[in-house]
């Protein structure tokens, strides 16, 4: 049993926070082996068609070992690789990038408000997304409602599958996610010196199978291990299934249950027919939506990483399943990025840097459509400030796949919370369109002209209207509609039942109907087709914009060398909340016309900027604008005022280097920098570097 194989105990050296590559590998080798060995077991069990419960147990243990390996890999990485989260969050809160929502009422966990800087950054991240995806790929953008009637989410599988188990503090009603709480409790018990080897082994076994327990098993475990509220020590209620969607009622009567959408995708699927028409009935095409989604997380803990309301940007790329080839794949084929295939995960390997073209050629990535999107996602994420070295694409293992996916790669970023998913890129096959077509009896298909007509064998149900009408009266229409859209596979299966048992049962719209030989038979005939119906496959890149934004915070947060107090965000200019600051060196009135003129010119050029004419020293004002990630700074100094042509200095936030240029040129220089048309190196090559004041005044721009 999996119980016999807890994660391998580590050599003492493993406790060090970082070490050289060879030393780290020595520590990781037994953990990698433990993962590989468990991977062998999972494969063997599947090969032997072992009972699913045994496979699930082994898979749970495999995941547990993978977690141990990953945690150790992270622990062994150099400490300077990890952001000082407390310091960063202090800056974010202090400068009102964001704050907890309803803070003056005590706040609500998992809900956040973005302040002016955070809001600007978020808008720029979204705007860059629109340019990078919607404009580049000519994607059809739509905007659907957040309120969704229950039948839609019943059909999509969310009502049944979108749930976690929850326990409640019996006295104060505080809720906890059952699996998280049990895990924390067992880990605490296991860390006790008095815990026997047998007990430890037993608990390891429980932890390994945590994802597989049902409601009753969890309830028993909570009793066996005497789990209490970690906060009050009070008793806990037995686990109950908790759907993560926010339920509501549409309209005053209370008879139309609905939910706040858990993803934006469903709106696109439901409008597929209209979108296909809009695209002149041709595949492939893509639709996108940016908007808020909602998940009623039981006890959100990790700041912006786990929230109850979050902005998503989702693309649904509809493609003919027989033509999963992207014409623009060559544009990204030469990108080198970290890929962490399912195969690598079960063999205890790390993510490996690979050329995208090779990954598709070698079958690591299934097709060029998926490959193209992975490449474009990579380019987008790095463009907005995510470090390529802290970004990987991890393939879901078979058992992790969402209920709708057949292949899935997550873009994951390395943060102080470990590796977190920031973009999912799923091949949803034809799951959603098929489900909604079945439920609504609306064929969600595209027609494809055949190169030459073909004769096909057709298998259909031939129902007896009279017999069905007699048996099911007003429900007969329901039955007939259902029978009209059944596929060949299903019809053949039912035909066997009809022949063996004389009847079969169908279920539609929550009702069950029994059909007997006198009500139905199966008709087979040939038909000539000039077009064929295609149920499109869907490739879905789904972006968690809040998580992307959080990653950008971590990957761009720095402390100035030699000055622990000076922190700054090195946001790429394209997403920086303000592209530049305008800083008059003195509050002297003669500086003001230049400030006004420059500010107006920047506005005309569409450059968001911030004027800081407060009385602090110039160094302190630079520090203040650096702290909110302002990309560039224009300083109006005494030379601006006293010399013609009027020039000012332009400072680069990251290098703190400055050039001098005419005021009239600065707006277009900053605009070009902000749009990514030129780099700071280009600017330095064209303009003289500025290193100190030329007018003999005490206050200088030097930092």
């Amino acid at each position: 049993s999996a119980a016999s194989c807890p994660p391998i105990s580590l050599p003492a050296a493993a406790s060090r926070s970082s070490m050289d590559g060879a030393g780290a590998e020595e520590v990781l080798a037994p953990l990698r082996l433990a993962v590989r060995q468990q991977g062998d077991l999972v494969r063997k069990l599947k090969e032997d068609k072992a009972p699913q419960v045994d496979v699930d147990k082994a898979v749970a243990e495999l995941k547990a070992r993978k977690r141990v390996l990953e945690a150790k890999e992270l622990a062994l990485q150099p400490k300077d690789d990890i952001v000082d989260r407390a310091k960063m969050e202090d800056t974010l809160k202090r400068r009102f990038f964001y704050d907890q929502a309803f803070a003056i009422y005590g706040g609500v966990s998992g809900l956040y408000d973005f302040g002016p800087v955070g809001c600007a950054l978020k808008n720029n991240i979204i705007q860059t997304w629109r340019q990078h995806f919607i404009q580049e790929e000519q994607i059809l953008e739509i905007d659907c409602t957040m309120l969704t009637p229950e039948p839609v989410l019943k059909t999509s599988g969310h009502v049944d599958k979108f749930a976690d188990f929850m326990v409640k503090d019996v006295k104060n009603g505080e809720c906890f996610r059952a699996d998280h709480l049990l895990k924390a409790h067992l880990q605490k018990l296991m860390s006790d010196k008095k815990c026997s080897v047998e007990k430890k082994s037993e608990m390891e076994s429980v932890l390994a199978q945590l994802d597989n327990y049902g409601q009753q098993e969890l309830a028993d475990l909570f009793v066996n291990y005497n789990v209490k509220s970690p906060i009050t020590g009070n008793d806990l209620s037995p686990p109950v299934s908790f759907n993560l969607m926010f339920k509501t009622f549409i309209g005053p009567g209370g008879n139309m249950p609905g939910y706040l959408r858990p993803e934006t995708a469903q709106g696109i699927f439901l409008n597929f027919k209209r979108l296909l028409e809009f695209n002149q009935g041709k595949l492939p095409f893509a639709a996108a939506q940016i908007g808020n989604s909602f998940r009623n997380e039981i006890s959100p803990r990790s700041g912006l990483i786990r929230v109850r309301e979050f902005t998503m940007a989702e693309i649904e790329h509809f493609v003919d399943p027989s033509e999963k080839d992207h014409p623009k794949f060559q544009n990204v084929a030469d990108l080198h990025l970290y890929l962490y295939s399912a195969k690598a995960q079960v063999s205890g390997q790390s993510a490996r840097k690979m050329r995208l073209g090779d990954a598709v050629e070698q079958g690591v990535i299934n097709n060029t459509v998926l490959g193209y999107f992975i490449g474009r996602i990579y380019l987008y994420l790095t463009k907005v400030g995510i470090s390529p070295d802290k970004l990987r694409f991890r393939q879901h293992m078979e058992n992790e796949m969402a209920h709708y996916a057949c292949d899935c790669w997550d873009a994951e970023s390395k943060t102080s919370y470990g590796w977190i998913e920031i973009v999912g890129c799923a091949d949803r096959s034809c799951y959603d369109l098929s489900c909604h077509a079945r439920a609504t009896k609306v064929p969600l298909v595209a027609e494809k002209p055949l190169k030459e007509p073909k004769t096909v064998n057709v298998v259909q149900f031939e129902p007896s209207k009279g017999a069905i009408g007699k048996a099911y009266k007003k429900d007969a229409k329901l039955v007939m509609e259902y029978l009209a859209i059944c596929d060949e596979c299903y019809i053949t299966e039912m035909e066997m039942l009809l022949n063996e048992k004389g009847e079969f049962t169908i279920e539609t719209e929550g009702k069950t109907f029994q059909l007997t030989k006198d009500m139905i038979n199966v008709k087979r005939f040939q038909k000539t087709l000039y077009v064929e119906e295609v149920v499109p496959n869907v490739i879905e890149p789904s972006f968690g914009l809040g998580r992307i934004m959080y990653t950008v915070f971590e990957h761009t947060f720095h402390v100035r060398e030699g000055d622990e107090q000076r922190t700054f965000f090195s946001f790429p200019a394209v997403v920086a909340p303000f592209k530049c600051s305008v800083l008059p060196l003195s509050q002297n009135q003669e500086f003001m016309p230049f400030v006004k003129e420059l500010s107006e010119a920047l506005t005309r050029h569409g450059v968001s900027h911030k004027v800081d004419d407060s009385s602090g020293s110039i160094g302190r004002r630079y520090a203040r604008t650096d702290e909110i990630g302002v990309a560039f700074g224009v300083t109006i100094d005494f030379d601006t005022v006293n010399k013609t042509p009027h020039t000012a200095t332009l400072r680069d936030r990251d290098s703190m280097r400055q050039i001098r240029a005419e005021i009239s040129e600065l707006p277009s220089i900053v605009q070009d920098l902000a749009n990514g048309n030129i780099t700071w190196a280009d600017v330095e090559a064209r303009y003289p570097l500025f290193e100190g004041q030329e007018t003999g005044k005490k206050e200088t721009i030097e930092e």
Epitope: S1, S4, C5, P6, I8, S9, A29, P30, R32, L33, R36, Q37, D40, L41, K44, L45, A58, V197, S201, K343, S347, Q349
Partner: antibody
């Protein structure tokens, strides 16, 4: 059908060298750890060495450390065991087997005799 | 001297149930999976039981494995003459970073 076929065994003098090969077929060779196990005449099984799929990790029994080298060529679906400084006690049938610990498939073995 | 200890021999009559034990330590059986192998005379070993108690496809359900602490056992019920063979237990040893076998048990069907 999974098949493992050892070759390269034979008679060798003490101190001599021999290279065993194991040709694999019927499965994705590059996905699996592979091992060598030996059995001296009339004796029990003894694990000798193992190697990870990417050649990154190699494991040896104390009795052969420093003398034997395991390697693989995934492009040829072949596992190797280079045996140097052979001793009389290395006389055995050498089997190659799949994985480091399951040994769910075995070859038919190749006999190595170390004798003067 | 093998790291895992097995009785050198065992016997039983057809139809009987026979058990073979295998004792080790926490670095092998205690914290790793146990496998059992059957070696018929003159042939290569064959995997009989893996990961303590799983049977590969094709192995009759008369063979079963179990484990408790640092010991494991193989049970054969409804003994048949074709079960006459050598049986080996084995497990990965985390301390040695290698695989260890028991000395083998010769099963005779009387």
């Amino acid at each position: 059908e999974v098949q493992l076929l050892e070759s390269g065994g034979g008679l060798v003098q003490p101190g001599g060298s021999l290279r065993l090969s194991c040709a694999a077929s019927g499965f994705t060779f590059s996905d699996y750890d592979m091992s060598w196990v030996r059995q001296a005449p009339g004796k029990g099984l003894e694990w000798v060495s193992a190697i990870s799929p990417d050649d990154g990790s190699k494991y040896y029994a104390d009795s052969v450390k420093g003398r034997f080298t395991i390697s693989r060529d995934n492009s040829k679906n072949t596992l190797y065991l280079q045996m140097n400084s052979l001793r009389a006690e290395d006389t055995a049938v050498y089997y190659c087997a799949r994985t480091t610990w399951l040994f769910d498939y075995w070859g038919q073995g190749t006999l190595v005799t170390v004798s003067s | 001297q093998s790291v895992l200890t097995q009785p050198p021999s065992a016997s039983g009559t057809p139809g009987q149930r026979v058990t073979i034990s295998c004792t080790g330590s926490s670095s092998n059986i205690g914290n790793n999976y146990v496998n059992w192998y059957q070696q018929l005379p003159g042939t290569a070993p064959k995997l009989l039981i893996y990961a303590d108690s799983h049977r590969p496809s094709g192995v009759p359900d008369r063979f079963s494995g179990s484990k408790s602490g640092t010991s494991a056992s193989l049970a054969i019920s409804g003994l048949r003459s074709e079960d006459e063979a050598d049986y080996y237990c084995g497990a990965w040893d985390s301390s040695l970073s290698g695989y260890v076998f028991g000395g083998g048990t010769k099963l005779t069907v009387l």
